[in-house]
Interface confidence: low
């Protein structure tokens, strides 16, 4: 693992970087007085950006609004006013710009229409916003148009009257396929799942909704669930929370066959004031948060088995404020198996925790080298790093950005944090990890906005300040050494950094406005770093790195979820372009099995800092509900189950007495008589 730099390391200046960047800095001043700006990238590697500016004056009876639409096809260096393509119409910003999936080039803008109109109006483009077609809708949209992930010509939308509308030709024609719809989502293979209310309304019927499915865009329907509170999709799992017969509690049921068969998830039931939340899901498993009774602000994280049915307790006292509230749960996408979140301790302080093995074990983040413990620390020599995420941002702390990681910038994690026994309200600094969260170093003093370019070859940052700024900082060695570049002589009120999603670009756009006595003028500066990274990286610029390596002497070093991965990573000292076509090079190898490769089966948990699974005391001797595919089941277990996605082979197989957990099926939700098919006549 490459460690943090010495504090006194000499940071050499990159030769002629000011001249190189000055020649590649492009200013665009927007000729309007708008109050807000929204920006969307259209397609991948196309360089096309759409910018929508809106100006609204609320008058006594109506509000007057004006929109302007700009388009760039060179990553934001130049913009063209294309407002005429949308007939100078006022666009509703709450619907945003609906950009089609993948590289479809499709864009939908929803227009504001006058009070008495029969329906809404949209502008549609299928050529990366070169041209737009105006289409009047037979309904007023309640939500943004949703594209089918499989076919971008298929759209669904809910109307303000709770109708479910579908288009098969990219919004040219629309058909109402169902009324009284509360929530609708695309599933795989162009399937639509939706809940309907039977008598009252979506709110009144909560817990008495029906879950329906159509696989042919509304020709035929199947009721796949009743007594539904809500539903969600995660990975290959379909979840529904279902009301119990006898009381006001509800339980999670899960299906892996689009709702044909359901199993009762082995999770605690929740009451009216509680909630379930899918924190993360992939094709193998799901992280589920179950809220604690009462207004505690915390709950428990459970991790699922490969069926999404059996759950292990993963983390207690997990911070999650309220339904739809704030949680710090973060998937570190730059290293497999790594997640960071926050817990609420008994004294109500908040602490960060990290898992390197997909929730099997959680630990505190290691204290950055050469850092001092702050006022939160009882022992000034022993403390850990605490990461600011969504919760801190919601509390209006000086945290401008959530943690950042990118799949193609292997091992890099950037986040605001403080060093102590708990998250501090004091102004945070920015920390970086280059090994997926195992070790950390202070990267920048004070709060900053930051972004990753060229798959980690460049990190860019801008100081978070309430004063106008004109300096951008950048690093070509994963945050060890920083150069400052004055991108304009006239400082701007900074509003955001924009770089193409995917972190492959070498362009960064700095957005903001200048303000004089009466006018506010939007401006963007796009800086292209191509001349800083002059040459393409070659074989010698990369070095091998074993991910998750903590004990180089051990033959199991680097084994996580049953296999280890060796990566080719850019050397910190190499100043070169990974390039847009860069593919992360990795070499996996299978590991022998150990206890770490097994999760605790239902009814078992791992005490902190232990490897063995022990029976959950509260479940001893209890008969528990268990439904597998709607049939009564006797679940037998030895307390262990292979972790989803674990690829270990051979080695140890945890053998212990197999227990019959005496489960009985009690869910009438799965009553086959409730499942009927209907045609749309």
């Amino acid at each position: 693992r490459r460690g943090a730099p010495a504090e006194d390391q000499d940071c050499g200046r990159l030769p002629d970087f000011i001249a190189k960047l000055t020649n590649n800095t492009h200013q665009h001043v927007f000729d309007d007085l708008s109050g807000s700006v929204s920006l969307s990238w259209v397609g991948d590697s196309t360089g096309v950006i759409l910018v929508l500016t809106t100006f609204q004056v609320p008058l006594v009876i109506v509000s007057f609004g004006q929109s302007k639409l700009y388009r760039s096809e060179d990553y934001g260096k130049n913009f063209k006013d294309i407002t005429n393509l949308i007939n100078n119409t006022f666009i509703r910003t709450e619907f945003g710009m609906a950009i089609g999936p993948e590289n479809s080039g499709k864009v939908i803008l929803t227009a504001e229409v006058s009070g008495g109109s029969r329906g809404g109006r949209v502008f549609r483009s299928s050529d990366f916003a070169k041209n737009f077609v105006q289409t009047d809708l037979p309904f007023h949209p309640l939500t943004q148009m949703m594209y089918s992930p499989q076919n971008s010509d298929y759209l669904l939308a809910l109307s303000t009257e709770n109708g479910l509308w579908v288009s098969k030709n990219f919004g040219e024609k629309w058909e109402e396929i169902h009324k009284a719809v509360c929530l609708a989502k695309w599933g795989p293979n162009n399937i639509i799942f939706f809940t309907t209310h039977v008598n009252g309304s979506c709110k009144a019927d909560l817990g008495a909704l029906e879950l329906w499915r159509t696989s042919d865009l509304g020709k035929t329907f199947k009721t796949i669930g009743v007594k539904i509170y809500s539903f969600g999709l995660g990975g290959r799992f379909l979840f529904a929370s279902v009301m119990a017969d006898k009381d006001t509690t509800r339980r999670i049921h899960v299906s892996t066959d689009q709702g044909d068969t359901w199993s009762m998830a082995q999770l605690p039931s929740v009451g009216q004031e509680q909630f379930y939340s899918i924190l993360a899901a992939n094709e193998d498993m799901v992280f589920m948060h179950v809220d604690e009774p009462g207004d505690t602000g915390f709950g428990t994280i459970f991790t699922s088995d490969d069926r999404g049915i059996v759950y292990s307790k993963s983390l207690d006292r997990h911070l999650y404020t309220t339904t739809g509230g704030e949680t710090d749960f973060t998937n570190v996408t730059s290293l497999r198996g790594v997640y960071i979140t926050s817990t609420l301790s008994e004294d109500n302080s908040i602490q960060s925790m990290i898992t390197f093995d997909q929730g099997g074990r959680w630990e505190h983040l290691r204290k950055p080298e050469n850092s001092k413990c702050d006022a939160t620390a009882k022992n000034k020599n022993e403390c850990s790093l605490h990461i600011h995420a969504s919760y801190s941002i919601s509390q209006k702390l000086n945290v401008p950005m959530a943690p950042l990681s990118e799949p193609n910038a292997v091992g890099i994690v950037i986040a605001h944090g403080s060093v102590g026994d708990a998250i501090s309200v004091m102004v945070p600094d920015v920390y970086i990890s280059d090994d997926g969260g195992y070790s950390w170093a202070k990267m920048l003093e004070g709060p900053h906005y930051y972004t990753i370019l060229d798959s980690g070859g460049i990190i860019v940052a801008i100081e978070h300040s309430n004063r106008p700024i004109n300096v951008i900082k950048f690093s070509t060695d994963e945050g060890q050494c920083w150069q400052s570049y004055v991108f304009t002589q006239e400082p701007i009120y900074f509003t955001g950094l924009a770089s193409e999603p995917g972190a492959r670009s070498m362009n960064i756009s700095i957005w903001g406005f200048t303000e004089s006595f009466i006018t506010r003028q939007w401006v963007s500066y796009t800086v292209d770093f191509k001349d800083i990274l002059e040459r393409n990286c070659e074989e010698d610029d990369y070095t091998t790195w074993l991910a998750h390596s903590t004990d180089p002497g051990d033959y199991k070093d680097g084994c996580i979820l049953g296999y280890k991965e060796q990566f080719l990573r850019l050397r910190k000292s190499s100043v070169c372009q990974n390039g847009r076509d860069y593919v992360v090079a990795k070499q996996p190898s299978v590991c022998p099995c150990s206890l770490e490769d097994f999760l605790c089966d239902f009814g078992y948990f791992r005490p902190e800092n232990a490897s063995e699974c022990v029976e959950q005391p509260e479940l001893k001797g209890h008969e528990l509900e268990f439904c597998l595919y709607g049939k009564e089941e006797h679940l037998t277990t030895n307390g262990y189950r292979k972790i989803p996605g674990d690829k270990c082979q051979g080695g140890m197989n945890p053998a212990r007495e197999v227990k019959d957990l005496k489960k009985k099926c009690t869910s009438n939700f799965l009553n086959p008589t409730k499942q009927n098919s209907k045609s749309n006549s």
Epitope: L344, D347, N348, S349, I350, A375, T376, S392, Q395, K396, L397, N398, A422, I423, S424, V425, M426, V427, G446, N466
Partner: antibody, heavy 125, light 108 residues
Amino acid sequence: QVQLVQSGAEVKKPGASVKVSCKASGYTFTSYGISWVRQAPGQGLEWMGSISAYNGNTNYAQKLQGRVTMTTDTSTSTAYMELRSLRSDDTAVYYCARDPSGGTTLHYYYGMDVWGQGTTVTVSS
Amino acid sequence: EIVLTQSPGTLSLSPGERATLSCRASQSVRSSYLAWYQQKPGQAPRLLIYGASSRATGIPDRFSGSGSGTDFTLTISRLEPEDFAVYYCDQLGSSPRTFGGGTKVEIK
């Protein structure tokens, strides 16, 4: 060492204004907030308000709202408290204190750990 | 607003004795939001305890804090001559921040 040094005593007439300064040294000024607390003769402590030295966010006690203004000057690491329309019951010792919470709460409060020496303000006709 | 009531108003004790000061809140206060200060005549207050039970830097271990909900206690295990002063509790659990009326610990 860490310290807060306040401006000297003031004598004011009713209806006038007073502006008390509080100069910080020995720590990063913008990493903390400053709270202002006053104490009338022979009485207890009364919180007046807080300001974040980082972003200037303020939080004032309801009873002083409209009469009090707290500001900071980060270039000189100085906090200021101005009280207008003075009355005789504003006679008190005014303290500034370093406040890690900066006027916000995030599930933990570390207390006002460094205090100025106090500024006596006398309001008398 | 949360009213903090300190009792007793005055505590007369001799050096070496144990002092127990109470702070009662009109509504529940999270323990993480409660602090105690000491103030001697003519001096600024000094932070003793934060988070209801954590000693501030440089505070001797004869000072300890405890409690939760609405009842909090500051204990001085063996009074030293320099401990005779007025003690205030302070909460930041809900706005506005409030102080208790103080307990005066005097020499008997």
